[in-house]
């Protein structure tokens, strides 16, 4: 198995996952594209936890990259052996792994207390109210209930898509920094598969 | 001045149709809701509803769904409030109220009333 | 729904008396409002958030309570002061208010 290849794969992945993330968390911020709610701070206190943008988003980016780095050929060696430093960089990978596990992580928690939460809106009486707030997150299987919140329009589905893609994006980092990390550990202590295919022992 | 000027009173006949307008001025009409107020004569008075200004979705107290409609005129800031297929006991003074989103939530500024009396 | 009783509902009163008037709920509440409304006109905002003072309105005028009873009172009463005062309560739906305590002036 050639972990590096396996590694920039993943590094790709974690990319286009962390700009999706990114897009995800901001479209939390203008329900219905509009402004208005997030400057009149009508959105859910889980919004400004900033999950996709930080957790999912930026903090991603950080261990994308040095996955992405590590299938270069001009990786620096150590001890006179080139192959000596890749092992090197696989290992401290599993540290920018690490890094990832932590922020996607987090961008799962705060998405999951989001969608069990619900929306800040308008309820049935006129006031701002996190309406489904104690039914513990059983809303979701009911959608005739959705209607209590009657501004802004859609807001619960706005919310439950896009908190749900935050959900599953941040799960599938998750999961490849976890990959990334037995990937790390095996590239570093069993040996690194270079461009000419070739395996050295420890 | 935030003021809500109501139309004038309405004599009418069981089975009639009626339309109450409140204008609003001195605001921004769609940053408050308006809610509207019945008080039969020598009664207390009774929530029938709200209307968002903003969306324009109106919502029904459970006494007044069906023969009751609000509706909107946003570019002439007017509330409507219609009632068809009238009734004795639809004879009252109905209020337009503006309402604030804030910490605590009350009716700020009340419309002086429209007088609907229903009559054969 | 949440009902709101007041009492007394017709409360006498001489100028300079201190007076108070309750409404109680039969379910908690998380605060209360108040109007006055005086003959031939529009109900006023009187007090807002179980305490806090609406624009224009006297010192003299005070609001307290919590849960399911709450109180206006009137330090000291003034001729001004007569009309009818409905308490309203926000926190459960449907919206609605008390029957009223009219405070008369002897």
């Known amino acids: 198995m050639c972990y590096g290849k396996c590694a920039r794969c993943i590094g790709h992945s974690l990319v286009g996952l962390a700009l999706l993330c990114i897009a995800a968390n901001i479209l939390l911020y203008f329900p219905n594209g509009e402004t208005k709610y997030a400057s009149e701070n009508h959105l859910s206190r889980f919004v400004w936890f900033f999950s996709g943008i930080v957790g999912g988003g930026l903090l991603m980016l950080l261990p994308a990259f040095v996955f992405i780095g590590l299938e270069q050929d001009d990786c620096c060696g150590c001890c006179g052996h080139e192959n000596c430093g890749k092992r090197c960089a696989m290992l401290s990978s599993v540290l920018a792994a690490l890094i990832g596990i932590a922020g996607s992580g987090y961008c799962v928690i705060v998405a999951a207390l989001g969608l069990a939460e619900g929306p800040l809106c308008l309820d049935s009486l006129g006031q701002w109210n996190y309406t489904f707030a104690s039914t513990e997150g059983q809303y979701l299987l009911d959608t005739s209930t959705w209607s209590e919140c009657t501004e802004p329009k859609h807001i619960v589905e706005w919310n439950v898509s896009l908190f749900s893609i935050l959900l599953a994006l941040g799960g599938i980092e998750f999961i490849l920094c976890l990959i990334q990390v037995i990937n790390g550990v095996l590239g570093g202590i069993c040996g690194f598969c270079c461009s000419h295919q070739q395996q050295y022992d420890c | 001045q935030i003021q809500l000027v109501q139309s004038g009173p309405e004599l009418k006949k069981p089975g009639e149709t009626v339309k109450i307008s409140c204008k609003a001025s001195?605001?921004?009409?769609?940053?408050?809701?308006v809610k509207w107020v019945k008080q039969a004569p020598g009664k207390d008075l009774k929530w029938m509803g709200w209307?968002?200004?903003?969306?324009?979705?109106?919502i029904y107290a459970a006494d007044f769904k069906g023969r009751f409609a609000f509706s909107l005129e946003t570019s002439a800031s007017t509330a409507f409030l219609q009632i068809n297929n009238l009734k004795n006991e639809d004879t009252a003074t109905y209020f337009c109220?503006?309402?604030?989103?804030?910490?605590?939530?009350?009716?700020?500024?009340w419309g002086a009333g429209t007088t609907v009396t229903v009559s054969s | 729904q949440i009902i709101l009783s007041q009492s007394p509902a017709i409360l006498s009163a001489s100028p300079g008396e201190k007076v108070t008037m309750t409404c109680r709920a039969n379910?908690?509440?998380?605060?209360i409002n108040w109007y006055q409304q005086k003959p031939g006109s529009s109900p006023k905002p009187w007090i807002y958030?179980?305490?806090n003072l609406a624009s224009g309105v006297p010192a003299r005028f005070g609001g307290s309570g919590s849960g399911t009873s709450y109180s206006l009172t009137i330090s000291r009463v003034e001729a001004e002061d007569a009309a009818t005062y409905y308490c309203?309560?926000?926190?459960?739906?449907?919206?609605?208010f008390g029957a009223g305590t009219k405070l008369e002036l002897r």
């Open positions: 379910s908690g509440i998380s605060f």
């Open positions: 958030g179980t305490a």
């Open positions: 309203q309560q926000w926190s459960s739906n449907p919206l609605t």
């Open positions: 001195g605001y921004t009409f769609t940053n408050y809701g």
């Open positions: 109220v503006r309402f604030q989103y804030g910490d605590y939530r009350y009716f700020d500024v």
């Open positions: 209307i968002n200004t903003y969306t324009g979705n109106p």
